[in-house]
Interface confidence: low
């Protein structure tokens, strides 16, 4: 089982970043930490998408990783996609500090995110509370600014 993974985020514009993943035990939480730059100040949706396909850019990555066929939600919600990691917050310099601990994603097993795509979005994720159908699918987070395939790290 892999205990560490890494993702380099890139897009068509200025947004780029590096995200690390670490899971010490197969059933334990995954620590997600890193940095994303080139964002507008404020909240940006942050999700693992189903496919590790970036052939046509971030759109090829498909929908949120959702092996349990649930509605979209926030990272602390029972009703959420496995890939729902919530939002990252960019400061006035456009840099987001990513410091997350999540017990739903995994680096092995049915919820394994390795080989899938991590995406940072244009707008804030409403965490499924937006009151429209799109909220229950994407959180109304808008376009995909940057993405990268999550790979095994040393």
């Amino acid at each position: 089982m892999a205990t560490k993974a890494v993702c380099v985020l890139k897009g068509d514009g200025p947004v780029q970043g590096i995200i690390n993943f670490e899971q010490k035990e197969s059933n334990g939480p995954v620590k997600v930490w890193g940095s994303i730059k080139g964002l507008t100040e404020g909240l940006h949706g942050f999700h693992v998408h189903e496919f590790g396909d970036n052939t046509a850019g971030c759109t090829s990555a498909g929908p949120h990783f959702n092996p349990l066929s649930r509605k979209h939600g926030g990272p602390k919600d029972e009703e959420r996609h496995v890939g729902d990691l919530g939002n990252v917050t960019a400061d006035k310099d456009g840099v987001a500090d990513v410091s997350i601990e999540d017990s739903v994603i995994s680096l092995s097993g049915d919820h394994c995110i390795i080989g899938r795509t991590l995406v940072v979005h244009e707008k804030a994720d409403d965490l499924g509370k937006g009151g429209n159908e799109e909220s229950t699918k994407t959180g109304n987070a808008g376009s995909r600014l940057a993405c990268g395939v999550i790979g095994i790290a040393q």
């Epitope: 500090d97 410091s99 601990e101």
Partner: antibody, heavy 117, light 107 residues
Framework: QVQLVQSGAEVKKPGASVKVSCKAS????????ISWVRQAPGQGLEWMGW????????NYAQKFQGRVTMTTDTSTSTAYMELRSLRSDDTAVYYC??????????WGQGTLVTVSS | DIQMTQSPSSVSASVGDRVTITCRAS??????LAWYQHKPGKAPKLLIY???SLQSGVPSRFSGSGSGTDFTLTISSLQPEDFATYYC?????????FGQGTKVEIK
Amino acid sequence: QVQLVQSGAEVKKPGASVKVSCKASGYTFTSFGISWVRQAPGQGLEWMGWISVYNDYTNYAQKFQGRVTMTTDTSTSTAYMELRSLRSDDTAVYYCARKRGGDMDYWGQGTLVTVSS
Amino acid sequence: DIQMTQSPSSVSASVGDRVTITCRASQDISSWLAWYQHKPGKAPKLLIYLASSLQSGVPSRFSGSGSGTDFTLTISSLQPEDFATYYCQQANSFPWTFGQGTKVEIK
């Protein structure tokens, strides 16, 4: 503007504990971690560890494991670093800093802790 | 732990000089490198993050480059206020570690 204001200088005896505070303002406290770094006289910078204000996750340098505790109080936007079982070689200036990804972009003014019998 | 080695440990230079400081990591750290300026009695100041990104408010005479294990901080034209000690810091893995520092002194 972002500011980190630390508590004043302390003089402690060997074996005692010290608790340094760091009050943040000018940004959303829970959106960034807080790192602690020290500098002993005539030495370089030494990273002690960090705490995620969002979920209280901590990561301490092995050297300080078991002797240091980092905490936060979101109601007052204040971070704390407690160091126990002080020794003379813990004499240093202790800095808090806002952790942003892989760097520390704003720093407190530093707190001098002197350990002397 | 990842060791960070800076060179030189000190450099004497004049105003207007181009100064280059190097930092070598004991293993690959990708772009997880920051540079700080530290003056006596003051808090350290972030200059460069993610190896080459200039922190806002920092003069453009400061630049960073490199990835993997070898990194460089360049001051294109040294100014009187630049005399200080400079530190590199890696954030590829915990514990974060600093280089031993490079003191830039007046010649």
